[in-house]
């Protein structure tokens, strides 16, 4: 599996999408797990509804949500209020019995909030008709890792 990089800004929401073959994975629940180390286990963060026919219902675990478009074949994970400690390698999984197939390997990168590093003169403030509350920003940039890139930095 190639690894896809999703970049999000600290404090904002990041949406990760994992496409899959809906017929191949028909009737299977899905999960989002975090890779513990390069060869470690993948620790379950959140999984879709217990009943596959209700997979479209958003399920939360803390600040992470999962929802599955089982007919269209897209699993969507939302990481709300992204924090630096959310950075790392994850997997979208398709579950069958006690087994799990990897749908996509995902590297989440957390970018510093640019507003935290600007002079007051450079800051943009919303006008009278604009407010941050009205804007639901889900910033997401994704790319595949280049050959030779490693998702885990070498440990000394």
């Amino acid at each position: 599996h190639n690894t896809t990089v999703f970049q999000g800004v600290a404090g904002q929401s990041l949406q990760v999408s994992c496409p899959y073959d809906s017929m191949k994975h028909w009737g299977r629940r899905k999960a989002w797990c975090r890779q513990l180390g390069e060869k470690g286990p993948c620790q379950r963060v959140v999984s879709t509804h217990n009943l596959w026919l209700l997979s479209f219902l958003r399920r939360w675990n803390g600040s992470t949500a999962i929802t599955d478009d089982t007919l269209g074949g897209t699993l969507t994970i939302t990481l709300r209020n992204l924090q630096p400690h959310d950075a790392g390698l994850y997997q979208c999984q398709s579950l069958h019995g006690s087994e799990a197939d990897t749908l996509r390997k995902v590297l989440v990168e957390v970018l510093a909030d640019p507003l935290d590093h600007r002079d007051a003169g450079d800051l943009w403030f919303p006008g009278e008709s604009e407010s941050f509350e009205d804007a639901h920003v889900e910033h997401s940039i994704s790319r595949s890792l280049l050959e030779g890139e490693i998702p885990f930095p070498p440990t000394s």
Epitope: W26, G27, H49, N50, L51, W52, L53, L54, F56, L57, R58, R59, W60, T70, L71
Partner: antibody, heavy 126, light 106 residues
Framework: EVQLVESGGGLVQPGRSLRLSCTAS????????MSWFRQAPGKGLEWVGF??????????EYTASVKGRFTISRDGSKSIAYLQMNSLKTEDTAVYYC?????????????????WGQGTMVTVSS | DIQMTQSPSSLSASVGDRVTITCQAS??????LNWYQQKPGKAPKLLIY???NLETGVPSRFSGSGSGTDFTFTISSLQPEDIATYYC????????FGGGTKVEIK
């Protein structure tokens, strides 16, 4: 008029089988998830299982206590949902209801059940 | 599995009274909760879905609120035809019902 009518209930011995029918009218049957519920005498409601709409190719889900014994199916041409009950136990004695899952205006559905049949009594006793 | 604790199990109130029933989930169920009315010998009837949405054709004296683990069902002014048992039903885990609340007239 939107309507569901159950039939097929009756007295049956433990270990035997029974098939309930739920005949739908007044709506496009294939567009809806159909569910079965039951209510033991003097007790509360219990979900038995449901079968997905045509888009979900009749995929079924069941509560743990009936899994492997009960089977839900549907016949789109007749607008009938079935509940096949095998290896019946005395604790399966109840009024059985079929119900329709509610559809949102945009086409999705919610597991709230907006149309119910009148119920059919199933008594499992020797 | 999620347990749904409904209270009280029964209540008696006068016509015109405000009646409140609560349903507590054993864990967070977002707003994935419905309320039904069942009259003796009859099938259940959907009143409220998604915790607070009034089903079409249901009188506005019925309402629902809450999210997470604590939910409330209210009849703002009890009518004689409201004599029934009321059930909550979650759909976050499976489709579990509360034990029911029997409402009677004083």
């Amino acid at each position: 008029e939107v309507q569901l009518v159950e039939s097929g209930g009756g007295l049956v011995q433990p270990g035997r089988s029974l098939r309930l029918s739920c005949t739908a009218s007044g709506f496009t049957f294939g567009e809806y998830t159909m569910s079965w519920f039951r209510q033991a005498p003097g007790k509360g409601l219990e979900w038995v299982g449901f079968i997905g709409s045509k888009a979900y190719a009749g995929t079924t889900e069941y509560t743990a206590s009936v899994k492997g014994r009960f089977t839900i199916s549907r016949d789109g041409s007749k607008s009938i949902a079935y509940l096949q009950m095998n290896s019946l136990k005395t604790e399966d004695t109840a009024v059985y209801y079929c119900a329709r899952g509610k559809r949102y205006s945009y086409g999705g559905w919610v597991p709230a059940f907006d149309v119910w049949g009148q119920g059919t009594m199933v008594t499992v006793s020797s | 599995d999620i347990q749904m604790t409904q209270s009280p199990s029964s209540l008696s109130a006068s016509v015109g009274d405000r009646v409140t029933i609560t349903c507590q989930a054993s864990q967070d169920i977002t707003n994935y909760l419905n309320w039904y009315q069942q009259k003796p010998g009859k099938a259940p009837k959907l009143l409220i879905y998604d915790a607070s949405n009034l089903e079409t054709g249901v009188p506005s004296r019925f309402s629902g609120s809450g999210s997470g683990t604590d939910f409330t069902f209210t009849i703002s002014s009890l009518q004689p035809e409201d004599i029934a048992t009321y059930y909550c039903q979650e759909y976050d885990s499976y489709l579990a019902f509360g034990g029911g609340t029997k409402v009677e007239i004083k």
